[in-house]
């Protein structure tokens, strides 16, 4: 997260760290007791490493009573996701067992009504992604509150030049933005999951290149079918 600040510890009990061989790779969001939603591209970077999900964490390195690392029983990328595009960039990870819920571990309600978030609405994005262009990684969860940008502006030739589909949304990226390592993490508006950080190799913190998020409401049928 660029230009953000340290999150209040455990105030985002839905927040997950998707890890490969014990290292943070992507963000994720607990959407059901045994399921974490993330970004499909995250798996590409996992190679043949051991994928696990850390829940109940604020610090990645320090011991915390609520922290627990779960093995992944199965990984379900969206069937239409492709390596060369950010379309359908969603991934569902089934944990090896149901998560032990508590104040620091709790699923987040996700948006089922397929309508756009109104431009100007402020939404929260959190993650353990890089906090500087030099690539500095934080140990503790960071967050930033960003205004949603209208799709027409986001699709301008000077911005994302038509790449933003109806199944995506954008947020302002003027010095404050999601970035590398935040992919798969949640964009939360008024206590409801609205978007998932896409995992393209987008430049971060440049206002002409707004943050891109996959709209979960657009994938309600797929999410429900996998979780069923």
């Amino acid at each position: 997260i660029l230009g953000g600040r340290e999150a209040e510890a455990h105030a985002r009990p839905y927040m997950a760290s998707v890890q490969v061989n014990g290292e943070h790779l992507c963000g994720g969001v607990l959407v059901a007791e045994q399921w974490v939603l993330s970004a499909a591209h995250c798996l590409e970077d996992a190679a043949d490493g051991k994928v696990q999900v850390l829940l109940g964490a604020h610090s990645l390195s320090q011991p915390e009573p609520s922290k627990r690392l779960y093995d992944v029983l199965r990984a379900v990328p969206h069937p239409d996701s492709r390596p060369d595009t950010i379309d359908h960039d969603l991934l569902l990870l089934q944990l090896s067992e149901k998560a032990t819920l508590g104040p620091a571990v709790r699923p987040l309600p996700w948006q089922r009504v397929d309508r756009d978030v109104e431009p100007g609405t402020l939404c929260d994005v959190a993650g353990w992604g890089i906090v500087s262009h030099a690539g500095r990684r934080p140990d503790r969860l960071q967050h930033v509150l960003l205004p949603v940008l209208d799709r027409a502006t986001c699709n301008r030739r000077t911005h994302h030049d038509g790449a933003i589909t109806q199944r995506m949304m954008c947020a302002e990226s003027n010095r404050r933005d999601s970035c590398k390592g935040d992919s798969g993490g949640p964009l939360v508006c008024g206590g409801v999951l609205e978007g998932v950080v896409t995992s393209g190799s987008r430049v971060c913190g440049n206002r002409k290149k707004p943050g891109i998020y996959t709209r979960v409401a657009s994938y309600a049928a797929w999410i429900d079918s996998v979780l069923a």
Partner: antibody, heavy 122, light 107 residues
Framework: QVQLQQSGPELVKPGASVKISCKAS????????INWVKQRPGQGPEWIGW????????YSNEKFEVKATLTVDESSSTAYMLLSSLTSEDSAVYFC???????????????WGQGTSVTVSS | DIQMTQSPASLSVSVGETVTITCRAS??????LAWFQQKQGKSPRLLVY???NLPDGVPSRFSGSGSGTQYSLKINILQSEDFGSYYC?????????FGGGTKLEIK
């Protein structure tokens, strides 16, 4: 205790400009959006817009886009609003207010300045 | 722009009574709503955020409810310090418009 201290009342002539200030204390100025709100006597408040001191990003109500210019001075933790081409319609009390965070993604205007009265009269 | 319509515009009540103020949005605002109290010549004070949540320090006699386009603020057992004007404000898209207000007066 979080405080937003606004500058004093202003009496200005039609067509002139006025710059009002809002000095923040007891919190990290660059972490919170500062909003500006207009209120005419006996009427409900009107949201003018916000500025985020950490990036100087602004977002304005279209109605006030030409009228109000929002700026900040990080070094003094002060937000400013410049009102230009003033008319009698601009006579009002102007408030600055911090957008506070509650939990993970809830927010509202939690701390307000005392208000600055602007009177436009020849 | 989303319009916020408050009712009633004014209300004359006695200490100890219970009152409900309503706010109707011109479209669904998905609970992105706050309520404020304002005394004459003073700044607004936040009472409720996200339609139902009370910030620290707000007495529990205040409660917010509602969803979609219809929201209400209830004040149980009115105290003398509760008299003044009340406003709703939405945060769903911009501009973040306020309601026209409800003036609560002592009977």
């Amino acid at each position: 205790q979080v405080q937003l201290q606004q500058s004093g009342p202003e009496l200005v002539k039609p067509g002139a400009s006025v710059k009002i200030s809002c000095k923040a204390s007891a919190y990290t100025f660059t972490d919170y959006y500062i909003n500006w709100v207009k209120q005419r006597p006996g009427q409900g408040p009107e949201w003018i817009g916000w500025i985020f001191p950490g990036s100087n990003s602004t977002y304005s109500n279209e109605k006030f886009e030409v009228k109000a210019t929002l700026t900040v001075d990080e070094s003094s933790s002060t937000a400013y609003m410049l009102l230009s081409s003033l008319t009698s319609e601009d006579s009002a009390v102007y408030f600055c207010a911090r957008l506070g965070y509650f939990g993970s993604s809830y927010h509202a205007l939690d701390y307000w300045g005392q208000g600055t009265s602007v009177t436009v009269s020849s | 722009d989303i319009q916020m319509t408050q009712s009633p515009a004014s209300l004359s009540v006695s200490v100890g009574e219970t009152v409900t103020i309503t706010c109707r949005a011109s479209e669904n605002i998905y609970s992105h709503l706050a309520w404020f109290q304002q005394k004459q010549g003073k700044s607004p004070r936040l009472l409720v955020y996200s339609a139902t949540n009370l910030p620290d320090g707000v007495p529990s006699r205040f409660s917010g409810s509602g969803s979609g386009t219809q929201y209400s603020l209830k004040i149980n057992i009115l105290q003398s310090e509760d008299f003044g004007s009340y406003y709703c404000q939405h945060f769903w898209g911009t501009p973040w418009t306020f309601g026209g207000g409800t003036k609560l007066e002592i009977k």
